[in-house]
Interface confidence: low
């Protein structure tokens, strides 16, 4: 027989025994070109002196063999005498040490037995009813396949699974989706309905994130407000990196978790845009306003849980940066202006009602006036800050009011609304003898003292009713008592107290009469 042909004679050895643990196994045969074929197998056991024979039986019952010597691979053409269009049965007989060992048989149609490729190119991954769906284009001329997958997590080894039979131009597989860990998948294919055919190699890794992106464990700190009215938000602790299976380490598209920072400016609600989302790497500058900051984690399946922090407002107040003048037509505020064409947001809120919504007004873009001041006015009818109570006023500025991260704080201060002059008048003025020529004057704190920085001082006025002489005594805003000395016994005096602000003189309290009794000696 010629070596290139299958020899239709009895092989040169005795019958085969298939019961041995050693011997030939894992025979696979397939077409490698339009007219070329290849069979290969494994041999278990010592190889010295072993001769291999590839046996083939046609459907007619005629059998032949190829002698391959010590080789465990054979290539032959469609002219070798083996019917490639009809079903044939193939096996290997290995002869060694006067005994023959036989492999399991493979029955197939050689022409249709193509060496299958694994899924190639782009494998699309999506979520379907709590499972993972993978989809890919069927390799050219390979429609009709059995597909397997294997998968592992960072803490588990490979596990094998079946995708079931595929018979279309696109193939797909439903696989388990892990809730909290990343997975690596690989796929392989073989010809459908051809148990004897060999599996393709495994595909490149497909890296799949957990269904739930990890909760971002980060910490923020916020710097003090700078002279420009802005403070920097800094990340104290980076989010922990997702643990990845071995094949997904390095640049592994598909498992990336992206973290985004969502800023919500709580102050100044009347501005155009209250929320902004930006990458976590871009830590923004903030105004002194109150913010909610959320870190949102997301992966290819969408957003996951977020973590939210509250950044309180910077309550540091500037002394007398704000001027308020009250006229018959209404009230005007003045403050040092920022650059040309700046939009200001003026926000006020009664002190002690921080939970309620602040009143907010947005100015049209304005330029500084000749004195370098910016202004905001309102009429008495509007009722703005009309009640006699303490208001917290904050003014923010931005040249780009729609850009949330470009707002800055101009000032933060307090103002007493309504008729502060009258409302601030001290009450419950009382006079007590202190010594033979002095008295102690006490009063209840002015309502203005509830407003930080508003009350500049108290003034106590004492009038001698005999001579009509008047003396005035300034008192620190934190004090509500003063001692009047050098008084004369038997003379009638009146005492009054008023509370002054930086821009407003208060109204005197009701006059309180007193005199020091003349001491009669025994």
């Amino acid at each position: 027989c010629r070596t290139s042909e299958c020899c239709f004679q009895d092989p040169p050895y005795s019958d085969a025994d298939s019961g041995s643990a050693s011997g030939p196994r894992d025979l696979s045969c397939y077409r490698i070109s339009s007219a070329g074929y290849e069979c290969s197998w494994q041999y278990e056991g010592p190889t010295a002196g072993v001769s291999h024979f590839l046996r083939c039986c046609l459907s007619s019952g005629r059998c032949c063999y190829f002698a391959t010597g010590s080789a465990t691979r054979l290539q032959f053409s469609d002219q070798a005498g083996v019917s490639v269009l009809h079903t044939v049965t193939l096996w290997v007989e290995s002869w060694a040490r006067n005994r023959t060992e036989k492999s399991p048989e493979v029955t197939l149609q050689l022409y249709k037995s193509v060496k299958y490729k694994p899924p190639l190119g782009d494998i699309k991954v999506s979520k379907l009813a709590g499972q993972l769906r993978m989809e890919w284009e069927t390799p050219d001329n390979q429609v009709g396949a059995e597909v397997q997958f294997r998968h592992r997590t960072p803490s588990s080894s490979w596990k094998l699974g079946d995708c079931g039979p595929q018979d279309d131009d696109t193939e797909s597989c439903l696989c388990p989706l892990e809730m909290n860990v990343a997975q690596e998948f690989q796929l392989r294919r073989r010809r459908l309905g051809s148990q004897g055919s060999s599996w393709s190699k495994w595909s490149s890794p497909v890296c799949v994130p957990p269904e739930n992106p990890p909760q971002p464990q980060v910490r923020f700190s916020v710097e003090q407000l700078g002279r420009d009215g802005r403070r920097r938000l800094t990340l104290k602790e980076q989010p922990t990196q997702l643990e990845l299976p071995e094949g997904c380490q390095g640049p592994a598209p598909g498992v990336e978790v992206t973290y985004q920072l969502q800023l919500h400016m709580l102050s100044c609600p009347c501005k155009a845009k209250a929320t902004r989302t930006l990458p976590l790497e871009k830590m923004p500058y903030l105004s002194g306003a109150a913010y909610n900051v959320a870190v949102i984690s997301s992966n290819r399946f969408g957003p996951g849980p977020n973590q939210t922090w509250h950044i309180p407002a910077d309550t540091h107040t500037e002394p007398v940066a704000l001027n308020i003048s009250v006229g018959t037509n209404g009230t005007t505020m003045y403050w040092p202006a920022r650059a040309q064409s700046t939009t200001y947001c003026i926000e006020w809120q009664p002190v002690g009602q921080e939970g309620s919504l602040a009143t907010c007004n947005l100015t049209a873009p304005q330029d500084p006036d000749p004195a370098g001041m910016a202004t905001y006015s309102w009429s008495r009818e509007s009722g703005a800050m009309g009640q006699e109570k303490c208001y917290h006023i904050t003014i923010f500025a931005s040249a780009h009011p729609k850009k949330l991260t470009l707002w800055s704080t101009v000032l933060s201060t307090y103002h007493f609304g309504g008729n502060a002059s009258a409302a601030g008048t001290p009450h419950h003025v009382s006079v007590k003898n202190h010594s033979l020529d002095s008295v102690s004057v006490d009063w209840a704190p002015s309502l203005l003292s509830t407003c930080p920085g508003v009350l500049k001082e108290y003034v106590v006025r004492c009038r001698d009713e005999d001579s009509n002489q008047v003396s005035e005594h300034p008192v620190q805003p934190t004090e509500t008592q003063v001692t009047l000395s050098d008084l004369r016994a038997g003379v009638a005096y009146t005492v009054q107290v008023r509370a002054d602000t930086a821009w407003l003189r208060g109204a005197w309290s009701q006059p309180q009469r007193f005199s020091i009794k003349v001491q009669v000696s025994d």
Epitope: S156, S157, K159, L160, K201, W202, E246, G247, Q249
Partner: antibody, heavy 118, light 107 residues
């Protein structure tokens, strides 16, 4: 056929390092993970870790972290396991084992006896 | 780590006997369990993978069953060449762990 052939026996002093090799043949070396398993005299089997011969990626058992290094040379289809800071209780036969397509160890090397003695 | 226990630790049997060895995992490992045979001075050889699948070339007298935490290896008719130590191993979680072994010797 698949064969995993080890380097010869080694005698080492405590504190030294040993490097054992495992030469693979009969299959495509880079297609299958290689694991290392040791067996102390008269004792059971203990898994040490694996190497992916294709990428060089490794996964070590916690017990050996910091002392074991697994490498490979694909040009000669050989995997290596180096164990440092040897102690007397590291005396064992060290086997390489191939992880098959079904994830289990389908072929084992005959092992290398490493004796640690002062 | 997942603990694997085997029982019995040793057994004596005669040729032709049916032998059963059990293996228990400290937590569920699905069917990621293998059985190995080891003879003195030799490397282990694979008998069963995925709890019940026979490794290529292994005679059908060996069979495996079980899932979750409890597994069994059965030798239907013990032959002289089967006297050896048998180990179970889980390969679902790292680190992979082996049972302590069951030694089968001649009665």
């Amino acid at each position: 056929q698949v064969q995993l052939v080890h380097s010869g026996p080694e005698v080492k002093k405590p504190g030294a390092s040993v490097k054992v090799s495992c030469k693979a043949s009969g299959y495509t070396f880079t297609d299958y993970y290689m694991h290392w398993v040791r067996q102390a005299p008269g004792q059971g089997l203990e898994w040490m870790g694996w190497i992916n011969p294709d990428s060089g990626g490794t996964n070590y058992a916690q017990k050996f972290q910091g002392r074991v290094t697994m490498t490979r040379d694909t040009s000669i289809s050989t995997a290596y396991m180096e164990l440092s800071r040897l102690r007397s209780d590291d005396t064992a036969v060290y086997h390489c084992a191939r992880e098959g397509a079904t994830s289990n160890f389908d072929y084992w090397g005959q092992g290398t006896l490493v004796t640690v003695s002062s | 780590d997942i603990q694997m226990t085997q029982s019995p630790s040793s057994l004596s049997a005669s040729v032709g006997d049916r032998v059963t060895i059990t293996c228990r995992a400290s937590q569920g490992i699905s069917n990621y369990l293998a059985w190995f045979q080891q003879k003195p001075g030799k490397a282990p050889t694979s008998l069963i993978y995925a709890a019940s699948n026979l490794q290529g070339g292994v005679p059908s007298k060996f069979s495996g069953s079980g899932s979750g935490t409890d597994f069994t290896l059965t030798i239907s008719s013990l032959q002289p060449e089967d006297f050896a130590t048998y180990y179970c191993q889980q390969y679902r979680y790292y680190p992979f762990t082996f049972g302590p072994g069951t030694k089968v010797d001649i009665k």
